[in-house]
């Protein structure tokens, strides 16, 4: 058993049929010694008396809010949560496996630049009695500070018969060094509590590996005289690290109709302009990627050919 | 060329060669990007490699003030990785063919380090750790880790030379 926060405790249980469970001793936070009784949740049934209560925790029925009282007055609470371990593996029932970029990916994180700011998100089908707490650091043995905000519900989607909820959190490294080569990964830890179930999820990454620039901005077209060709120009996204002579992007320019199966023109460039062939009913799209490190491409920025 | 005395390097040549190094580092093992090597407990293997750190002057402001600190750091790293790529880790079993991207990478690391430091001038270099894994599978894993680390190192070096070519060239 360990303390998650004040008056909230996590009991780690090996979860299998007829498991013996864990013996837990609760102590009432009071100077009083006599006349103390214990109850669980809203029940008035007295579970025991005395300053301490010893219980055998085996299942969710044994978890919950234990309260010690004296003469009708509440002295203190202890909330017991369960953390299940099945076949040596901690349960991951609360969050959905996003399976990208690999199986058992529960947390996904992205950064728009090298400033040390990043966003992580996760999915669940649970709608109520759900809380998250996020901590982060750079490195684990001698951790350096990363400050995370509160996790918030950022999207709701319908997937078949199920509703899916997306939560996200923003974090910022306290003393970021955008130009340095990272040697210690960022660690992100999410505590998830659903009713009386506790689970924790972690992710470890370098900012450079989660970079995904915003799409290029201000796409403009200039038809070339006596030619089917069009000069397309754009600018670096505002959110990208500066100066651009140091933090350079490379671009993919594509002309395509509405369907992915349609024919296309495509060219890669390090410049902020390119010459392509425009077709009626097609769009010109541009996306960006770090020029020197193969992290994710941005989403496309598009303008119609006409 | 960046010499210890403090003259400027051939920024544009260094830019071209460092960009080539980036391409080679990714073609040497593109799938490395999809392996989570941190799960393999690599502290003892890749923590010894030289990293371009915050105080090394490789940021735009540091380069403007005095590029020598940064160039020396990059030179140390290039020599270090050049030695690693020529070591038993890469020459032992399972063997690499002579024209593999690792071979080209090795040659390009040497080429850039020579551009930065002509013969007759010597910056101190970092000792190469004695990493000689006994099993071929350990060697393979170590190669992946070294290449992954090299990808990050050459990305920073390429940014330095691109910025230098754009803003510090005579």
């Amino acid at each position: 058993i360990w303390e998650l926060k004040k008056d909230v405790y996590v009991v780690e249980l090996d979860w299998y049929p007829d498991a013996p469970g864990e013996m837990v001793v609760l102590t009432c936070d009071t100077p009083e010694e006599d006349g103390i009784t214990w109850t669980l949740d809203q029940s008035s049934e007295v579970l025991g008396s005395g300053k301490t209560l010893t219980i055998q925790v085996k299942e969710f029925g044994d978890a919950g809010q234990y309260t010690c009282h004296k003469g009708g007055e509440v002295l203190s609470h202890s909330l017991l949560l369960l953390h299940k371990k099945e076949d040596g593996i901690w349960s991951t029932d609360i969050l959905k496996d996003q399976k990208e970029p690999k199986n058992k990916t529960f947390l996904r994180c992205e950064a728009k630049n090298y400033s040390g700011r990043f966003t992580c998100w996760w999915l669940t089908t649970i709608s109520t009695d759900l809380t998250f707490s996020v901590k982060s650091s750079r490195g684990s043995s001698d951790p350096q500070g990363v400050t995370c905000g509160a996790a918030t519900l950022s999207a709701e989607r319908v997937r078949g018969d199920n509703k899916e909820y997306e939560y996200s959190v923003e974090c910022q490294e306290d003393s970021a060094c955008p130009a340095a080569e990272e040697s210690l990964p960022i660690e992100v830890m999410v505590d998830a509590v659903h009713k009386l179930k506790y689970e924790n999820y972690t992710s470890s990454f370098f900012i450079r590996d989660i970079i995904k620039p915003d799409p290029p901005k201000n796409l403009q077209l200039k038809p070339l005289k006596n030619s089917r060709q069009v000069e397309v120009s754009w600018e670096y996204p505002d959110t990208w690290s500066t100066p651009h002579s140091y933090f350079s992007l490379t671009f993919c320019v594509q002309v395509q109709g509405k369907s992915k199966r349609e024919k296309k023109d495509r060219v890669f460039t390090d410049k902020t302009s390119a010459t392509v062939i425009c077709r009626k009913n097609a769009s010109i799209s541009v996306r960006a990627q770090d020029r020197y490190y193969s992290s994710s491409w941005s989403e496309w920025a598009s303008v119609p050919c006409s | 060329r960046a010499v210890p005395g403090g003259s400027s390097p051939a920024w544009t040549q260094c830019q071209q060669l460092s960009q080539k190094l980036c391409t080679l580092a990714w073609s040497a093992h593109p799938l490395v990007g999809h392996m989570d090597l941190r799960e393999e407990g690599d502290e003892e293997t890749t923590n010894d490699v030289p990293h371009i750190q915050c105080g090394d002057g490789c940021d735009p402001q540091g380069l403007r003030d005095n590029s020598q600190f940064c160039l020396q750091r990059i030179h140390q790293g290039l020599i270090f990785y050049e030695k690693l790529l020529g070591s038993d880790i890469f020459t032992g079993e399972p063997s690499l063919l002579p024209d593999s991207p690792v071979g080209q990478l090795h040659a390009s690391l040497l080429g850039l380090s020579q551009l930065l430091q002509p013969e007759g001038h010597h910056w101190e270099t970092q000792q190469i750790p004695s990493l000689s894994p006994s099993q071929p599978w350990q060697r393979l894993l170590l190669r992946f880790k070294i290449l992954r680390s090299l990808q990050a190192f050459v990305a920073v070096a390429a940014r330095v030379f691109a910025h230098g070519a754009a803003t510090l060239s005579p």
């Epitope: 490379t250 199966r261 023109d265 060219v267 890669f268 460039t269 062939i277 077709r279 | 073609s27």
Partner: antibody, heavy 118, light 107 residues
């Protein structure tokens, strides 16, 4: 199977015009760009131009501008290359090539030898 | 026009050898470079697109790398059917241009 079948060999006199055909099958003709590339004997490849059969848009290499015409007939799924004012250095194998992507060549015809000789 | 220069113009090699062909562009072309194989009397065949992207149906012994101005095509463990002429082609700008070719001959 995507295929391009070209017309047979031609012998032409200097100053004449040649018209070669390229019949497409195995795909929707207007879904691919059609290019023409030539190769002189024992020489390399030389791109001549392209057509978008969907709308008839064309682009030619400056070297051939004014002498070359590329057309496409969507009713017969056939592309054509017409080269006028022939000279001896136009002796070459002419290939049609197609792709959904404009700038490289995925499918090739078998080639048509054009000999220009007096 | 962008000039493409291939080297060597010919190379003699044996079955099982590893062969590397290089292609240099007269100006930076990012990764807008493609490789073709041509056998005598036949049309060219696409091997690699955009410098390093593999083509379905092309054996994995063919690989490409490079960006900017310098590119290479590597044939890992040469097979009897690989003796042919290889061409690079830039697609950075029109007119599309090819390298002069590299003939891979039997030693």
């Amino acid at each position: 199977e995507v295929q391009l079948v070209q017309s047979g060999a031609e012998v032409k006199k200097p100053g004449a015009t040649v018209k070669i055909s390229c019949k497409a099958s195995g795909y929707t003709f207007s879904d691919y760009y059609l290019h023409w590339v030539r190769q002189a004997p024992e020489k390399g490849l030389e791109w001549m131009g392209w057509i978008d059969p969907e709308n008839g848009d064309t682009e030619y290499a400056p070297k051939f501008q004014g002498r070359v015409t590329i057309t496409a007939d969507t009713s017969t799924d056939t592309g054509y290359l017409e080269l006028s004012s022939l000279r001896s250095e136009d002796t070459a194998v002419y290939y049609c090539a197609a792709n959904k992507e404009l700038r490289y060549f995925d499918v090739w015809g078998q080639g048509t030898l054009v000999t220009v000789s007096s | 026009d962008i000039q493409m220069t291939q080297s060597p113009s010919s190379v003699s090699a044996s079955v099982g050898d590893r062969v590397t062909i290089t292609c240099r562009a007269s100006q930076s072309i990012s990764i807008n470079l493609h490789w073709y194989q041509q056998k005598p009397g036949k049309a060219p065949k696409l091997l690699i697109k955009f410098a390093s992207q593999s083509i379905s149906g092309v054996p994995s012994r063919f690989s490409g790398s490079g960006s900017g101005t310098d590119f290479s095509l590597t044939i890992n463990s040469l097979q009897p059917e690989d003796f042919a002429t290889y061409y690079c082609q830039q697609s950075n700008s029109f007119p599309l241009t090819f390298g002069g070719g590299t003939k891979v001959e039997i030693k």
